[in-house]
Protein backbone atom coordinates (compact mmCIF):
# COMPACT_ATOMS: atom_id res chain seq x y z
CA UNK A 1 0.00 0.00 0.00
CA UNK A 2 1.30 3.45 -0.88
CA UNK A 3 0.65 6.05 1.79
CA UNK A 4 -1.07 9.04 0.24
CA UNK A 5 0.01 12.52 1.16
CA UNK A 6 -2.82 15.02 1.28
CA UNK A 7 -2.44 18.54 0.04
CA UNK A 8 -4.39 20.98 2.17
CA UNK A 9 -6.04 23.79 0.22
CA UNK A 10 -7.41 26.70 2.22
CA UNK A 11 -9.89 29.02 0.53
CA UNK A 12 -12.54 31.56 1.45
CA UNK A 13 -16.19 31.29 0.43
CA UNK A 14 -16.77 32.57 -3.09
CA UNK A 15 -13.29 31.75 -4.36
CA UNK A 16 -12.46 29.30 -7.12
CA UNK A 17 -10.44 26.12 -6.72
CA UNK A 18 -8.39 25.14 -9.77
CA UNK A 19 -6.61 21.82 -9.79
CA UNK A 20 -4.21 20.14 -12.22
CA UNK A 21 -4.18 16.34 -12.22
CA UNK A 22 -1.50 14.82 -14.40
CA UNK A 23 -1.55 11.26 -15.67
CA UNK A 24 0.54 8.88 -17.74
CA UNK A 25 -0.33 9.71 -21.35
CA UNK A 26 0.43 6.28 -22.71
CA UNK A 27 -1.89 4.64 -20.17
CA UNK A 28 -4.75 7.04 -19.68
CA UNK A 29 -5.00 9.52 -22.56
CA UNK A 30 -8.16 7.81 -23.82
CA UNK A 31 -9.67 7.02 -20.44
CA UNK A 32 -12.51 8.90 -18.80
CA UNK A 33 -11.54 11.00 -15.80
CA UNK A 34 -13.59 11.97 -12.78
CA UNK A 35 -13.55 14.27 -9.78
CA UNK A 36 -14.76 12.68 -6.59
CA UNK A 37 -15.34 13.58 -2.96
CA UNK A 38 -14.94 11.23 -0.04
CA UNK A 39 -18.11 10.91 1.99
CA UNK A 40 -17.23 8.86 5.02
CA UNK A 41 -15.37 5.85 3.68
CA UNK A 42 -17.05 5.99 0.29
CA UNK A 43 -16.11 8.22 -2.63
CA UNK A 44 -18.83 10.00 -4.57
CA UNK A 45 -18.27 10.92 -8.22
CA UNK A 46 -19.18 14.58 -8.66
CA UNK A 47 -18.33 14.93 -12.34
CA UNK A 48 -16.71 12.86 -15.06
CA UNK A 49 -15.47 13.48 -18.56
CA UNK A 50 -17.22 12.17 -21.66
CA UNK A 51 -16.12 9.24 -23.74
CA UNK A 52 -12.82 10.00 -25.50
CA UNK A 53 -13.24 12.23 -28.50
CA UNK A 54 -10.87 14.14 -30.72
CA UNK A 55 -12.47 17.48 -29.90
CA UNK A 56 -13.31 17.11 -26.23
CA UNK A 57 -15.32 19.86 -24.56
CA UNK A 58 -15.40 20.95 -20.94
CA UNK A 59 -17.92 19.05 -18.85
CA UNK A 60 -19.86 21.14 -16.35
CA UNK A 61 -21.86 19.81 -13.42
CA UNK A 62 -23.18 22.71 -11.38
CA UNK A 63 -20.18 24.64 -10.09
CA UNK A 64 -17.68 22.00 -11.22
CA UNK A 65 -16.01 22.05 -14.63
CA UNK A 66 -13.67 19.34 -15.91
CA UNK A 67 -11.52 19.69 -18.98
CA UNK A 68 -9.30 16.89 -20.15
CA UNK A 69 -6.20 17.68 -22.22
CA UNK A 70 -5.18 14.22 -23.44
CA UNK A 71 -2.35 15.66 -25.56
CA UNK A 72 -0.85 17.10 -22.42
CA UNK A 73 -1.69 14.35 -19.96
CA UNK A 74 -3.60 16.80 -17.80
CA UNK A 75 -7.06 17.06 -16.31
CA UNK A 76 -8.16 20.55 -15.27
CA UNK A 77 -10.73 20.85 -12.48
CA UNK A 78 -12.50 24.08 -11.58
CA UNK A 79 -14.86 24.47 -8.62
CA UNK A 80 -16.33 27.97 -8.56
CA UNK A 81 -18.06 29.93 -5.81
CA UNK A 82 -16.76 27.68 -3.05
CA UNK A 83 -18.96 27.17 0.00
CA UNK A 84 -18.08 26.05 3.54
CA UNK A 85 -19.95 22.80 2.93
CA UNK A 86 -17.60 22.02 0.02
CA UNK A 87 -14.87 21.32 2.57
CA UNK A 88 -13.67 17.75 2.43
CA UNK A 89 -11.35 15.30 0.74
CA UNK A 90 -11.29 15.20 -3.07
CA UNK A 91 -9.51 13.12 -5.69
CA UNK A 92 -8.97 13.01 -9.40
CA UNK A 93 -9.49 9.50 -10.66
CA UNK A 94 -9.36 7.53 -13.86
CA UNK A 95 -12.96 6.40 -14.27
CA UNK A 96 -12.84 2.80 -15.43
CA UNK A 97 -16.17 1.49 -14.20
CA UNK A 98 -18.70 2.51 -11.53
CA UNK A 99 -17.13 -0.08 -9.25
CA UNK A 100 -13.50 0.71 -10.01
CA UNK A 101 -11.43 3.89 -10.30
CA UNK A 102 -7.69 4.55 -10.34
CA UNK A 103 -6.68 7.42 -8.07
CA UNK A 104 -4.47 10.03 -9.64
CA UNK A 105 -1.86 11.02 -7.10
CA UNK A 106 -2.46 12.98 -3.92
CA UNK A 107 -5.91 13.57 -2.48
CA UNK A 108 -6.82 17.18 -1.87
CA UNK A 109 -8.10 18.30 1.51
CA UNK A 110 -10.21 21.36 0.77
CA UNK A 111 -10.96 23.70 3.66
CA UNK A 112 -13.38 26.51 2.89
CA UNK A 113 -13.96 29.14 5.53
CA UNK A 114 -16.26 32.12 5.78
CA UNK A 115 -14.81 35.60 5.47
CA UNK A 116 -13.59 38.11 2.94
CA UNK A 117 -13.16 36.29 -0.35
CA UNK A 118 -11.25 39.03 -2.13
CA UNK A 119 -7.76 38.18 -3.33
CA UNK A 120 -5.49 39.13 -0.40
CA UNK A 121 -2.82 41.65 -1.18
CA UNK A 122 -0.04 40.04 0.82
CA UNK A 123 3.21 39.75 -1.05
CA UNK A 124 4.57 36.88 1.04
CA UNK A 125 5.68 34.41 -1.53
CA UNK A 126 8.14 31.72 -0.50
CA UNK A 127 8.77 29.81 -3.70
CA UNK A 128 10.49 27.05 -1.78
CA UNK A 129 7.26 25.91 -0.17
CA UNK A 130 4.89 24.44 -2.70
CA UNK A 131 2.45 23.59 0.06
CA UNK A 132 1.85 27.06 1.43
CA UNK A 133 -1.62 28.51 1.85
CA UNK A 134 -2.71 30.27 -1.35
CA UNK A 135 -2.96 33.66 0.36
CA UNK A 136 -1.37 35.48 -2.53
CA UNK A 137 -2.88 33.53 -5.38
CA UNK A 138 -6.46 32.97 -4.36
CA UNK A 139 -8.60 32.73 -7.45
CA UNK A 140 -11.08 35.30 -8.67
CA UNK A 141 -14.50 35.53 -7.07
CA UNK A 142 -17.66 33.80 -8.11
CA UNK A 143 -18.47 31.75 -11.18
CA UNK A 144 -15.81 32.32 -13.79
CA UNK A 145 -16.97 30.01 -16.51
CA UNK A 146 -18.21 32.63 -18.93
CA UNK A 147 -16.36 31.24 -21.91
CA UNK A 148 -18.41 30.81 -25.09
CA UNK A 149 -16.93 27.34 -25.53
CA UNK A 150 -19.29 24.41 -25.76
CA UNK A 151 -19.84 22.95 -22.30
CA UNK A 152 -21.33 19.51 -21.87
CA UNK A 153 -23.71 19.24 -18.92
CA UNK A 154 -23.56 15.94 -17.07
CA UNK A 155 -25.63 14.53 -14.19
CA UNK A 156 -24.03 13.75 -10.82
CA UNK A 157 -22.83 10.18 -10.39
CA UNK A 158 -23.56 7.70 -7.65
CA UNK A 159 -21.08 6.38 -5.14
CA UNK A 160 -18.21 4.16 -6.31
CA UNK A 161 -15.63 2.02 -4.57
CA UNK A 162 -11.96 2.77 -5.15
CA UNK A 163 -9.42 0.17 -6.15
CA UNK A 164 -6.20 1.23 -7.76
CA UNK A 165 -4.07 -1.42 -9.44
CA UNK A 166 -1.25 -0.46 -11.76
CA UNK A 167 1.43 2.15 -11.55
CA UNK A 168 -0.57 4.95 -10.01
CA UNK A 169 -1.50 4.73 -6.31
CA UNK A 170 -2.43 1.47 -4.66
CA UNK A 171 -5.03 1.41 -1.93
CA UNK A 172 -5.92 -1.75 -0.12
CA UNK A 173 -8.64 -0.05 1.85
CA UNK A 174 -10.55 3.14 1.20
CA UNK A 175 -9.90 4.21 4.79
CA UNK A 176 -6.25 4.67 3.80
CA UNK A 177 -7.35 7.94 2.28
CA UNK A 178 -8.71 9.22 5.55
CA UNK A 179 -5.68 8.66 7.76
CA UNK A 180 -2.91 10.39 5.91
CA UNK A 181 -0.67 13.27 6.98
CA UNK A 182 -1.55 16.79 5.97
CA UNK A 183 1.00 19.38 4.88
CA UNK A 184 0.31 22.79 6.37
Amino acid sequence: TTELTEEKYEYKEGQTLEVKCDYALEKYANSRKAWQKMEGKMPKILAKTERPSENSHPVQVGRITLEDYPDHGLLQVRMTNLQVEDSGLYQCVIYQHPKESHVLFNPICLVVTKGSSGTPGSSENSTQNVYRTPSTTAKALGPRYTSPRTVTQAPPESTVVVSTPGSEINLTNVTDIIRVPVFN
Epitope: E18, K20, C21, I108, T137, S147
Partner: antibody, heavy 124, light 107 residues
Protein backbone atom coordinates in the same frame (compact mmCIF):
# COMPACT_ATOMS: atom_id res chain seq x y z
CA UNK B 1 21.64 29.15 -4.78
CA UNK B 2 18.38 28.27 -6.53
CA UNK B 3 19.13 27.90 -10.22
CA UNK B 4 18.69 25.96 -13.44
CA UNK B 5 21.91 25.44 -15.37
CA UNK B 6 21.61 24.49 -19.04
CA UNK B 7 24.04 22.79 -21.38
CA UNK B 8 26.03 24.74 -23.95
CA UNK B 9 25.24 25.87 -27.47
CA UNK B 10 24.84 23.27 -30.21
CA UNK B 11 25.16 23.34 -33.98
CA UNK B 12 23.27 20.59 -35.80
CA UNK B 13 22.55 19.57 -39.34
CA UNK B 14 18.98 19.27 -40.65
CA UNK B 15 17.51 15.86 -39.79
CA UNK B 16 19.72 15.41 -36.75
CA UNK B 17 18.66 15.40 -33.09
CA UNK B 18 19.69 17.58 -30.18
CA UNK B 19 19.48 16.87 -26.45
CA UNK B 20 19.57 19.83 -24.09
CA UNK B 21 20.10 19.36 -20.37
CA UNK B 22 18.88 21.45 -17.45
CA UNK B 23 20.41 20.84 -14.01
CA UNK B 24 18.47 22.06 -10.98
CA UNK B 25 20.11 23.08 -7.73
CA UNK B 26 19.11 24.82 -4.52
CA UNK B 27 15.63 23.29 -4.34
CA UNK B 28 13.93 19.89 -4.39
CA UNK B 29 13.98 18.92 -8.05
CA UNK B 30 11.02 16.54 -7.82
CA UNK B 31 8.71 19.12 -6.24
CA UNK B 32 8.29 21.33 -9.29
CA UNK B 33 7.34 20.61 -12.88
CA UNK B 34 9.90 21.53 -15.52
CA UNK B 35 8.68 23.20 -18.71
CA UNK B 36 10.49 23.92 -21.93
CA UNK B 37 10.03 27.17 -23.85
CA UNK B 38 11.84 28.22 -26.99
CA UNK B 39 12.51 31.52 -28.70
CA UNK B 40 13.59 31.77 -32.31
CA UNK B 41 15.78 34.76 -33.16
CA UNK B 42 13.70 37.92 -33.17
CA UNK B 43 10.56 35.94 -32.34
CA UNK B 44 8.35 35.51 -29.30
CA UNK B 45 8.24 32.78 -26.68
CA UNK B 46 6.76 29.39 -27.51
CA UNK B 47 5.81 26.73 -24.96
CA UNK B 48 6.86 23.20 -25.92
CA UNK B 49 5.60 21.11 -23.03
CA UNK B 50 6.04 20.04 -19.45
CA UNK B 51 7.39 17.23 -17.32
CA UNK B 52 6.68 16.10 -13.78
CA UNK B 53 10.16 15.13 -12.50
CA UNK B 54 8.69 13.12 -9.65
CA UNK B 55 6.69 10.69 -11.74
CA UNK B 56 8.13 11.28 -15.19
CA UNK B 57 4.76 12.22 -16.69
CA UNK B 58 4.99 14.53 -19.68
CA UNK B 59 2.80 16.56 -21.98
CA UNK B 60 3.80 18.04 -25.32
CA UNK B 61 2.33 20.74 -27.51
CA UNK B 62 0.79 19.19 -30.64
CA UNK B 63 3.23 20.99 -32.92
CA UNK B 64 6.13 19.09 -31.34
CA UNK B 65 4.52 15.70 -30.72
CA UNK B 66 6.50 12.88 -32.29
CA UNK B 67 9.67 15.00 -32.37
CA UNK B 68 10.17 16.00 -28.74
CA UNK B 69 10.96 13.85 -25.72
CA UNK B 70 11.31 15.18 -22.20
CA UNK B 71 13.05 13.01 -19.64
CA UNK B 72 14.84 13.37 -16.33
CA UNK B 73 17.44 11.80 -14.11
CA UNK B 74 16.37 12.46 -10.53
CA UNK B 75 19.68 11.16 -9.13
CA UNK B 76 21.44 14.19 -10.59
CA UNK B 77 18.43 16.58 -10.55
CA UNK B 78 18.59 17.04 -14.30
CA UNK B 79 15.89 17.39 -16.92
CA UNK B 80 16.43 16.76 -20.62
CA UNK B 81 14.69 17.87 -23.78
CA UNK B 82 15.46 16.02 -26.99
CA UNK B 83 14.23 17.34 -30.31
CA UNK B 84 14.62 15.15 -33.40
CA UNK B 85 14.30 15.61 -37.16
CA UNK B 86 15.68 19.11 -36.83
CA UNK B 87 14.95 21.72 -39.48
CA UNK B 88 16.22 25.26 -39.96
CA UNK B 89 13.15 26.75 -38.27
CA UNK B 90 14.11 24.94 -35.04
CA UNK B 91 17.05 27.34 -34.71
CA UNK B 92 16.25 29.02 -31.39
CA UNK B 93 17.22 29.53 -27.80
CA UNK B 94 15.69 26.73 -25.71
CA UNK B 95 14.86 27.48 -22.08
CA UNK B 96 13.94 25.19 -19.24
CA UNK B 97 11.68 26.83 -16.69
CA UNK B 98 10.31 25.81 -13.31
CA UNK B 99 6.57 25.91 -12.79
CA UNK B 100 5.81 27.34 -9.40
CA UNK B 101 2.47 26.56 -7.80
CA UNK B 102 0.97 27.17 -4.40
CA UNK B 103 0.43 23.43 -4.22
CA UNK B 104 1.81 20.71 -6.42
CA UNK B 105 -1.64 20.14 -7.91
CA UNK B 106 -2.67 23.77 -8.40
CA UNK B 107 -3.65 24.85 -11.92
CA UNK B 108 -1.01 27.55 -11.92
CA UNK B 109 1.66 28.01 -14.53
CA UNK B 110 4.02 30.65 -13.18
CA UNK B 111 7.55 30.24 -14.49
CA UNK B 112 9.50 31.75 -11.63
CA UNK B 113 12.90 30.25 -12.39
CA UNK B 114 14.49 29.95 -15.83
CA UNK B 115 17.70 28.55 -17.20
CA UNK B 116 19.89 30.96 -19.17
CA UNK B 117 18.95 29.25 -22.40
CA UNK B 118 20.72 27.00 -24.88
CA UNK B 119 21.18 28.22 -28.43
CA UNK B 120 20.55 25.46 -30.96
CA UNK B 121 21.53 26.32 -34.51
CA UNK B 122 20.33 24.09 -37.33
CA UNK B 123 22.29 24.63 -40.49
CA UNK B 124 23.56 22.58 -43.37
CA UNK C 1 -5.46 27.36 -29.09
CA UNK C 2 -5.95 30.62 -27.23
CA UNK C 3 -4.38 33.45 -29.23
CA UNK C 4 -2.85 36.32 -27.26
CA UNK C 5 -2.79 39.66 -29.07
CA UNK C 6 -0.36 42.00 -27.39
CA UNK C 7 -0.11 45.69 -28.20
CA UNK C 8 1.74 47.79 -28.99
CA UNK C 9 4.56 45.74 -30.43
CA UNK C 10 6.98 48.51 -29.46
CA UNK C 11 6.88 51.84 -27.70
CA UNK C 12 9.19 54.66 -26.78
CA UNK C 13 8.60 56.74 -23.68
CA UNK C 14 10.46 59.17 -21.47
CA UNK C 15 11.86 58.36 -18.04
CA UNK C 16 9.11 58.83 -15.47
CA UNK C 17 6.30 58.26 -17.99
CA UNK C 18 3.41 55.90 -17.35
CA UNK C 19 3.55 52.96 -19.76
CA UNK C 20 0.62 50.69 -20.54
CA UNK C 21 0.66 47.41 -22.48
CA UNK C 22 -2.45 45.39 -23.28
CA UNK C 23 -3.06 41.75 -23.99
CA UNK C 24 -6.28 40.41 -25.47
CA UNK C 25 -7.11 36.71 -25.38
CA UNK C 26 -9.20 35.03 -28.06
CA UNK C 27 -11.36 33.50 -25.31
CA UNK C 28 -11.95 33.87 -21.58
CA UNK C 29 -8.82 32.95 -19.64
CA UNK C 30 -10.26 33.44 -16.15
CA UNK C 31 -7.53 35.84 -14.91
CA UNK C 32 -4.98 33.10 -15.60
CA UNK C 33 -2.38 35.47 -17.01
CA UNK C 34 1.25 36.28 -16.22
CA UNK C 35 3.60 39.05 -17.35
CA UNK C 36 7.33 38.57 -17.96
CA UNK C 37 10.24 40.90 -18.62
CA UNK C 38 13.01 39.83 -20.95
CA UNK C 39 16.28 41.68 -21.37
CA UNK C 40 18.72 40.93 -24.22
CA UNK C 41 20.78 37.83 -23.53
CA UNK C 42 18.91 37.09 -20.32
CA UNK C 43 16.16 34.66 -19.38
CA UNK C 44 12.61 35.99 -18.95
CA UNK C 45 11.70 37.18 -15.46
CA UNK C 46 8.28 36.75 -13.87
CA UNK C 47 6.82 40.12 -12.83
CA UNK C 48 3.06 39.62 -12.41
CA UNK C 49 1.14 36.38 -11.91
CA UNK C 50 -2.57 35.58 -11.99
CA UNK C 51 -3.32 38.93 -13.69
CA UNK C 52 -2.58 41.23 -10.77
CA UNK C 53 -0.23 39.68 -8.20
CA UNK C 54 3.21 41.23 -7.93
CA UNK C 55 6.02 38.68 -7.78
CA UNK C 56 8.26 38.92 -4.72
CA UNK C 57 11.14 41.36 -5.20
CA UNK C 58 9.56 43.12 -8.17
CA UNK C 59 9.27 46.93 -7.79
CA UNK C 60 5.79 48.25 -7.04
CA UNK C 61 5.82 50.48 -10.13
CA UNK C 62 4.83 47.34 -12.06
CA UNK C 63 1.18 46.32 -11.90
CA UNK C 64 -1.37 44.23 -13.75
CA UNK C 65 -5.13 44.22 -14.06
CA UNK C 66 -7.96 42.86 -16.18
CA UNK C 67 -10.42 40.01 -16.43
CA UNK C 68 -12.16 37.87 -19.02
CA UNK C 69 -10.29 38.45 -22.26
CA UNK C 70 -8.70 41.87 -21.67
CA UNK C 71 -5.62 42.48 -19.54
CA UNK C 72 -3.34 45.44 -18.91
CA UNK C 73 0.22 45.75 -17.68
CA UNK C 74 1.39 49.12 -16.36
CA UNK C 75 4.72 50.67 -15.42
CA UNK C 76 3.71 53.70 -13.37
CA UNK C 77 7.02 55.54 -13.75
CA UNK C 78 9.39 54.25 -16.42
CA UNK C 79 13.00 53.77 -15.30
CA UNK C 80 16.11 53.22 -17.46
CA UNK C 81 16.42 49.65 -16.13
CA UNK C 82 12.94 48.87 -17.46
CA UNK C 83 14.22 48.82 -21.04
CA UNK C 84 13.23 45.33 -22.11
CA UNK C 85 10.67 43.28 -23.98
CA UNK C 86 7.52 42.36 -22.05
CA UNK C 87 5.39 39.29 -22.68
CA UNK C 88 2.01 38.17 -21.42
CA UNK C 89 1.35 34.44 -21.00
CA UNK C 90 -2.02 32.78 -20.51
CA UNK C 91 -2.69 29.52 -18.71
CA UNK C 92 -6.48 29.50 -18.62
CA UNK C 93 -6.44 26.91 -21.39
CA UNK C 94 -3.84 24.60 -22.85
CA UNK C 95 -1.57 24.93 -24.67
CA UNK C 96 0.00 27.79 -22.77
CA UNK C 97 0.49 30.69 -25.15
CA UNK C 98 2.43 33.95 -25.06
CA UNK C 99 1.72 37.33 -26.53
CA UNK C 100 3.99 38.58 -29.30
CA UNK C 101 5.89 40.88 -26.96
CA UNK C 102 6.24 44.63 -26.49
CA UNK C 103 9.65 46.23 -26.81
CA UNK C 104 9.96 49.20 -24.46
CA UNK C 105 12.58 51.86 -25.15
CA UNK C 106 13.42 55.21 -23.57
CA UNK C 107 13.29 58.35 -25.68
Amino acid sequence: QVQLVQSGAEVKKPGASVKVSCKASGYTFTSYDINWVRQATGQGLEWMGWMNPNRGNTGYVKKFQGRVTMTRDTSISTAYMELSSLRSEDTAVYYCARRRAVYRSSWEWYFDLWGRGTLVTVSS
Amino acid sequence: DTQMTQSPSSLSASEGDRVTITCQASQDIFNDLNWYQEKPGKAPKLLIYHASNLETGVPSRFSGSGSGTDYTFTISSLQPEDIATYYCQQYGNLPLTFGGGTKVEIK
